[in-house]
């Protein structure tokens, strides 16, 4: 057992049927010495008396808030949480693989430039009594510090027969160092509880590793003289590091009807401009990526060639 | 020429040769970007390789004031990994292709590293590490670290370079 | 299966002109760009320009402009050359290649071999 | 336009000798970059896409690098079908234009 924070502990358990469980002793926080009485969540039901209860924790229903009282006042709370180990593995209920780009990925993370600011996000079918808490570092045996905000419930999905819920949360490395070669892996760690149940999470990866930058951005057609030829240009996205004589992009340039289907032309560059054949109907849209390091593509930003 | 006396490097041979040593360095293994070696417990290898820090000046702002610690922190690193690619990690069983493109790429960082250090000038370099993987798999796994960190020095080496030739250059 | 059959070998006389054929199959003509490419003997090959069938647009290498014309009619799935104010020098084989994408040549068709000789 | 040179003009090699061709453009072309072969009296084969994207049905001992001005396609253990003429292009931009062709032949 082990404090997740103050008055909420999580108790470790083997899950297999006919498990011992775990021998669990609650302190009521306070002076008083005689005339304590235990309840566990609303029930009125008296479990033990005197200053600690000892209770064997197997199942669900031997987990939540365990309450001392003397004379109808409440003294202090212990909220339990159970944490499930089946086969050696930790339970993965709460969250759901989101299998890219590999499986048992449930946290995924995205930086939009070095400057240290990231985000991730993780999905879920569950809609009520659960909360996230995200801590985040640079190393692990001498963490360095990353600020996490609150995880918010960004998106929701109608998948089939089931809703799903995104969640998202946005980091930011205390002291980024956007030009130097990364050594150590930011390290994310998401607690997760459901009801009377905790899960956690955890990734791991270099800043390097998840860039994928905005779109392109202000794109510009300018027809040549005499020619099915078009001029396009575009501009480094607003939110990628600075500057660009040292943090560049190479661009993908593609022009293509509605359906993918279609004949196309494609052209990759380290310009921002590129001379391209525009047809009716078709779109041209223009991605990045690092010019250094093979991270993620950007998304495309489309103009229509008419 | 970046020599110790402080002349300039010639940047723009400096970069093209440096997004060359990219281009190989993925192409010498693609698929060690999906692979996630962090889980093999990297401690022993990579934090034996320099690295460019924080405070070595290759960030746009140190290179402008003077570049010489930074193509020092390069130079180290890029014979650091000319010695990790000419050793029996590379040339042990599973053996390589010859003229695969991790022999470019040998190629290549002993080229850079020329640029950068002229006969006759000479920067400390940081000793090798004695690492001598006893199984091929072993080897194979060395390999792919080593390779996933030089795609990275590489990628901020290539950076100095594009900067300085753009920025600095007479 | 993708396939492009060109017409047979042409002998033609300087000053001539010829057209020769290119008759797709297997896909949808105007789904691919068309494009033409001459091989001299034991000489490299040289890009002559391309046409979209979807619309008859059509681009040509500026050395080809003016000596040759290319066109395409969807209703046979047809690709033509034609190559005008014919020389010695016009003597090769020409090839027709299609592709989704514009700039590089996924299907070939086995050539046609042009002579012109006096 | 943008010249393509190829070298070396021919080389002599053994079957399941690795094979390097180079490709060198006057200017850069990024990965703008596609490989050919062609055989005597045959059409071209697209082998490589943009310097370096394999080609489904092309055997995996062809492979493709660079990006630039330099690119290489090699031919790892060379098979008595591989012996042909190889041919870079570019697509960089407009003419579309070829190398002069290396050919591969036996030794």
């Known amino acids: 057992i082990w404090e997740l924070k103050k008055d909420v502990y999580v108790v470790e358990l083997d899950w297999y049927p006919d498990a011992p469980g775990e021998m669990v002793v609650l302190t009521c926080d306070t002076p008083e010495e005689d005339g304590i009485t235990w309840t566990l969540d609303q029930s009125s039901e008296v479990l033990g008396s005197g200053k600690t209860l000892t209770i064997q924790v197997k199942e669900f229903g031997d987990a939540g808030q365990y309450t001392c009282h003397k004379g109808g006042e409440v003294l202090s709370h212990s909220l339990l949480l159970l944490h499930k180990k089946e086969d050696g593995i930790w339970s993965t209920d709460i969250l759901k693989d989101q299998k890219e780009p590999k499986n048992k990925t449930f946290l995924r993370c995205e930086a939009k430039n070095y400057s240290g600011r990231f985000t991730c996000w993780w999905l879920t079918t569950i809609s009520t009594d659960l909360t996230f808490s995200v801590k985040s570092s640079r190393g692990s045996s001498d963490p360095q510090g990353v600020t996490c905000g609150a995880a918010t419930l960004s998106a929701e999905r109608v998948r089939g027969d089931n809703k799903e819920y995104e969640y998202s949360v946005e980091c930011q490395e205390d002291s980024a160092c956007p030009a130097a070669e990364e050594s150590l892996p930011i390290e994310v760690m998401v607690d997760a509880v459901h009801k009377l149940k905790y899960e956690n999470y955890t990734s791991s990866f270099f800043i390097r590793d998840i860039i994928k930058p905005d779109p392109p951005k202000n794109l510009q057609l300018k027809p040549l003289k005499n020619s099915r030829q078009v001029e396009v240009s575009w501009e480094y996205p607003d939110t990628w590091s600075t500057p660009h004589s040292y943090f560049s992009l190479t661009f993908c340039v593609q022009v293509q009807g509605k359906s993918k289907r279609e004949k196309k032309d494609r052209v990759f560059t380290d310009k921002t401009s590129a001379t391209v054949i525009c047809r009716k109907n078709a779109s041209i849209s223009v991605r990045a990526q690092d010019r250094y390091y093979s991270s993620s593509w950007s998304e495309w930003a489309s103009v229509p060639c008419s | 020429r970046a020599v110790p006396g402080g002349s300039s490097p010639a940047w723009t041979q400096c970069q093209q040769l440096s997004q060359k040593l990219c281009t190989l360095a993925w192409s010498a293994h693609p698929l060690v970007g999906h692979m996630d070696l962090r889980e093999e417990g990297d401690e022993e290898t990579t934090n034996d390789v320099p690295h460019i820090q924080c405070g070595d000046g290759c960030d746009p702002q140190g290179l402008r004031d003077n570049s010489q610690f930074c193509l020092q922190r390069i130079h180290q690193g890029l014979i650091f990994y000319e010695k990790l690619l000419g050793s029996d990690i590379f040339t042990g069983e599973p053996s390589l292709l010859p003229d695969s493109p991790v022999g470019q790429l040998h190629a290549s960082l002993l080229g850079l590293s020329q640029l950068l250090q002229p006969e006759g000038h000479h920067w400390e370099t940081q000793q090798i590490p004695s690492l001598s993987p006893s199984q091929p798999w072993q080897r194979l796994l060395l390999r792919f670290k080593i390779l996933r960190s030089l795609q990275a020095f590489v990628a901020v080496a290539a950076r100095v370079f594009a900067h300085g030739a753009a920025t600095l250059s007479p | 299966e993708v396939q492009l059959v060109q017409s047979g070998a042409e002998v033609k006389k300087p000053g001539a002109t010829v057209k020769i054929s290119c008759k797709a199959s297997?896909?949808?003509?105007?789904?691919?760009?068309l494009h033409w490419v001459r091989q001299r003997p034991e000489k490299g090959l040289e890009w002559m320009g391309w046409?979209?069938?979807?619309?008859?647009?059509?681009e040509y290498a500026p050395k080809f402009q003016g000596k040759v014309t290319i066109t395409a009619d969807t209703s046979t799935d047809t690709g033509y050359l034609e190559l005008s104010s014919l020389r010695s020098e016009d003597t090769a084989v020409y090839y027709c290649?299609?592709?989704?994408?514009?700039?590089?040549?996924?299907?070939w068709g086995q050539g046609t071999l042009v002579t012109v000789s006096s | 336009d943008i010249q393509m040179t190829q070298s070396p003009s021919s080389v002599s090699a053994s079957v399941g000798d690795r094979v390097t061709i180079t490709c060198r453009a006057s200017?850069?072309?990024?990965?703008?970059l596609h490989w050919y072969q062609q055989k005597p009296g045959k059409a071209p084969k697209l082998l490589i896409k943009?310097?370096?994207q394999s080609i489904s049905g092309v055997p995996s001992r062809f492979s493709g690098y660079g990006s630039g001005t330099d690119f290489s396609l090699t031919i790892n253990s060379l098979q008595p079908e591989d012996f042909a003429r190889y041919y870079c292009?570019?697509?960089?931009?407009?003419?579309?234009?070829f190398g002069g062709g290396t050919k591969v032949e036996i030794k």
């Open positions: 290649a299609a592709n989704k994408e514009l700039r590089y040549f996924d299907v």
């Open positions: 297997g896909y949808t003509f105007s789904d691919y760009y």
């Open positions: 046409i979209d069938p979807e619309n008859g647009d059509t």
């Open positions: 200017q850069s072309i990024s990965i703008n």
């Open positions: 943009f310097a370096s």
């Open positions: 292009q570019q697509s960089n931009s407009f003419p579309l234009t």
